[in-house]
């Protein structure tokens, strides 16, 4: 996601499962810290946003032709799992220790 | 990158190494097809944008709170190498068959 002014970084995003309709099958937790990647991918791309070569190229082309080519985008580059208690197909409460890809571990410019 | 109206997809982006100042060390090719990921990550996220669970969650939160949380972003999810002839540290023209991460192979919503 983009954000005015600040550079690409991980910010808080608390998600309530009721808000997204997932409370129908996720029993617990009621909410969790998903985090969000926010901020711009500005030249020069710093090491901490682990840019790919393509992101570096796109950033340089954007510098030269800002109206033609967009900046690279600040996105999750590494995700972490959370533990959930959910209803299985039979409606039985089941604990899944590692429900993958739910929380941002790292952000970067891509 | 984002794009008004159209959904996340791979579009052409021809990059001239002179435009980004890399012609000082890349001898050939003079330009190449880098591609760019353009378009929006709209609800519901289609399978072809290979959304992560976090991207799906963020999309749902954005639907509920559009001013608070951004949409997922359309970015390269798989990159390909290109062959380059470059000047090594001694200035000797050297062929690198696979200079990784230079061209978009696939785009997705992250």
């Amino acid at each position: 996601s983009t954000g005015a002014g600040s550079h690409c970084q991980k910010t808080s995003l608390r998600v309530n499962f009721e808000d997204i309709g997932w409370n129908s099958w996720i029993i617990a937790p009621k909410e969790y810290e998903a985090y969000e990647c926010k901020g711009g991918c500005f030249f020069p791309l710093a090491d901490d946003v682990t840019p790919t070569k393509h992101a570096i190229v796109q950033t340089l082309v954007h510098l030269k032709f800002p109206t033609k080519v967009g900046k690279a985008c600040c996105v999750p580059t590494k995700l972490s799992p959370i533990s959930i208690l959910y209803k299985d197909d039979m409606g039985v409460p089941t604990l899944k220790y590692h429900y993958e890809g739910m929380s941002v571990a790292e952000c970067g410019c891509r | 990158s984002t794009g008004a109206g159209s959904h996340c997809q791979k579009t052409s982006l021809r990059v001239n190494f002179e435009d980004i100042g890399w012609n000082s060390w890349i001898i050939a090719p003079k330009e190449y097809e880098a591609y760019e990921c353009k378009g929006g990550c709209f609800f519901p996220l289609a399978d072809d944008v290979t959304p992560t669970k976090h991207a799906i969650v963020q999309t749902l939160v954005h639907l509920k709170f559009p001013t608070k949380v951004g949409k997922a972003c359309c970015v390269p999810t798989k990159l390909s190498p290109i062959s380059i002839l470059y000047k090594d540290d001694m200035g000797v023209p050297t062929l690198k068959y696979h200079y990784e991460g230079m061209s978009v192979a696939e785009c997705g919503c992250r």
Epitope: - | I27, A28, S83, P93, H98
Partner: antibody, heavy 120, light 109 residues
Framework: EVQLVQSGAEVKKPGESLKISCKGS????????IGWVRQMPGKGLEWMGI????????TYSPSFQGQVTISADKSISTAYLQWSSLKASDTAMYYC?????????????WGQGTLVTVSS | QSVLTQPPSVSGAPGQRVTISCSGS????????VSWYQQLPGTAPKLLIY???KRPSGVPDRFSGSKSGTSASLAITGLQAEDEADYYC?????????FGGGTKLTVLG
């Protein structure tokens, strides 16, 4: 339609010189690598070297370095392979091939081959 | 002696699945991509697979490539009489391109 057309078969004597050609058409000749591959009778493929016609940059296999010269004339979209002094062991089929645009290590179009026979 | 090692010959009956192996080292296959070529008798080689597992347009999906560590393999399913040919693997080693010695595929009558 992409085509690589090679010059005809040659019969030469040991010690003679030779230059065979490979003419590209149907694509931008200067921006694709052209490789040369040898195939001795009944044997496998051997990579000889490669050239980027735009600047005539070449890279040779260590086995062929100094034995042959690879060149190109971009004005007529033609690549060349030449010997200054042929040996009987140079008897083989020689193929030119075009490297894929972004991947010079994969040859997507091939010439029909030029058979070179060196015999006294 | 080729840098990449292939079996001299393999065979299979029509409709069967055959695989051709290609063994190298960390400096070639281990660190780089693999291509496969088919050479029908009396003709120039044809690119079948590039970048380990990608097929150029026009190559049937009966042909597939894979790579693991310092080895690669070509699989041909639903073997047909017209698949009888020599098959070569290739990879890169620094600035150089290297071929396997070739494998003759015989389709049993």
């Amino acid at each position: 339609e992409v085509q690589l057309v090679q010059s005809g078969a040659e019969v030469k004597k040991p010690g003679e010189s030779l230059k065979i050609s490979c003419k590209g058409s149907g694509y931008s000749f200067t921006t694709y690598w052209i490789g040369w591959v040898r195939q001795m009778p009944g044997k496998g493929l051997e990579w000889m070297g490669i050239i980027y016609p735009e600047g005539s940059y070449t890279t040779y296999s260590p086995s062929f370095q100094g034995q042959v010269t690879i060149s190109a004339d971009k004005s007529i979209s033609t690549a060349y392979l030449q010997w200054s002094s042929l040996k009987a062991s140079d008897t083989a089929m020689y193929y030119c091939a075009r490297g894929k645009r972004v991947d010079a290590s994969s040859f997507d179009y091939w010439g029909q081959g030029t058979l070179v026979t060196v015999s006294s | 002696q080729s840098v990449l090692t292939q079996p001299p010959s393999v065979s299979g009956a029509p409709g069967q699945r055959v695989t051709i192996s290609c063994s190298g080292s960390s400096s070639n296959i281990g660190d780089n991509y693999v291509s496969w070529y088919q050479q029908l008798p009396g003709t120039a080689p044809k690119l079948l697979i590039y970048r380990n597992n990608k097929r150029p347009s026009g190559v049937p999906d009966r042909f597939s490539g894979s790579k693991s560590g310092t080895s690669a393999s070509l699989a041909i399913t639903g073997l047909q009489a017209e698949d009888e040919a020599d098959y070569y693997c290739s990879s890169t080693d620094k600035e150089h391109l290297v071929f396997g010695g070739g494998t003759k595929l015989t389709v049993l009558g």
